[in-house]
Interface confidence: low
Amino acid sequence: HTAAQDNCTCPTNKMTVCSPDGPGGRCQCRALGSGMAVDCSTLTSKCLLLKARMSAPKNARTLVRPSEHALVDNDGLYDPDCDPEGRFKARQCNQTSVCWCVNSVGVRRTDKGDLSLRCDELVRTHHILIDLRHRPTAGAFNHSDLDAELRRLFRERYRLHPKFVAAVHYEQPTIQIELRQNTSQKAAGDVDIGDAAYYFERDIKGESLFQGRGGLDLRVRGEPLQVERTLIYYLDEIPPKFSMKRLTA
């Protein structure tokens, strides 16, 4: 089904306007900001979510060290251009004709330029490192329990296939979740790691995108896991292209 039929809402995206206008009176939902129809049985793409949002805003020794090419989303919110499938267009521009290239999660991967800037293809983000710091607890979480709970969360709440959760690292109070998904690995119907990471990020911030569900209540063996800081690193299949000035800054 595409949406909750009883009251015509979108369980996986509250930033929608829904009406039962589909075949046989089936509920159909369209994303705010773009008017694009969304499939409410799965996660909505990050591009459409960002567009909707705009219409309505460290490394310990055993933990993964992000590579020199890892990107962090420092540019914040912007009103993106999405393609007919809801993916980010490779080139994004603002109202003042400043343009830049983005990766598949919408993060800038080049210096900013003008309308002459070319972005030949949408480069896929194949590795996402979610770096969390949890609030102090009586003791450290059991690593195996934490690993199991986070894998369950991504499988059940975000519908991400377990094979894409590559690892869960833990060194109190830092947790790192590695998501990996190459272009060749992602089959039709698979949730994109970028979309899952974005839903998780919004959940962690107490800004759940799910309709009617309570906020994220993360518990490990009954003990609340409260996150106080989140950093997300994005690694692309092709390294980003920034000027030396940025790389040495």
């Epitope: 009883d6 009251n7 015509c8 306007v17 009406s19 039962p20 206008d21 046989g24 009176g25 159909q28 369209r30 994303a31 705010l32 900001g33 773009s34 008017g35 694009m36 567009k51 705009m54 219409s55 309505a56 009103d79």
Partner: antibody, heavy 117, light 107 residues
Amino acid sequence: EVQLVQSGAEVKKPGASVKVSCKASGYTFTSYWINWVRQAPGQGLEWMGNIYPSNSYTNYNQKFKDRVTMTRDTSTSTVYMELSSLRSEDTAVYYCSSYRSDGFAYWGQGTLVTVSS
Amino acid sequence: EIVLTQSPATLSLSPGERATLSCRASQNIGTSIHWYQQKPGQAPRLLIEFASESISGIPARFSGSGSGTDFTLTISSLEPEDFAVYYCQQSNSWPFTFGGGTKVEIK
């Protein structure tokens, strides 16, 4: 053929309430939102809110939230819009309309409500 | 709420001429805009939905374009029955709102 037939014209005094009906036919009544839109004489269109007959789920325009109530009777495929505490500026033609996507494709003939002392 | 501003308020044209009506939204609404025609004493009639999607039964001379904040309804060649008031409406967010209307009158 989809049809929305509304009740007749009403004349009300300020402070009174009015209840306008909209009877639907030609489609599955519970499967489409019914919207209410009003139009004051010589003025434009103003969306008041809508109701989903399947479960009476409603969305109201904040402007009317305290004064408007939308209900439905599935046995007669009829939706009602009640507006209370009427004032002279509520004098308007009140239309019911049903969705085709988010555009309002089907409209009732309109009901003129006159508020006058 | 999202404010829709239509221009011009009145458009004076002759039959056979091309009519271009504008609707500007106070914020980005993607393609969540719909166009209606209303004649005196009648209910509005849906012409175009989601900026450019045609409605069955509506003549092909009516077309829509635009996205974001600027939208256009075009009547390629005015017929006598096209002289009426035209409204745009957004469904991007509650409350749904309408533009103030553009009256297309015979010159």
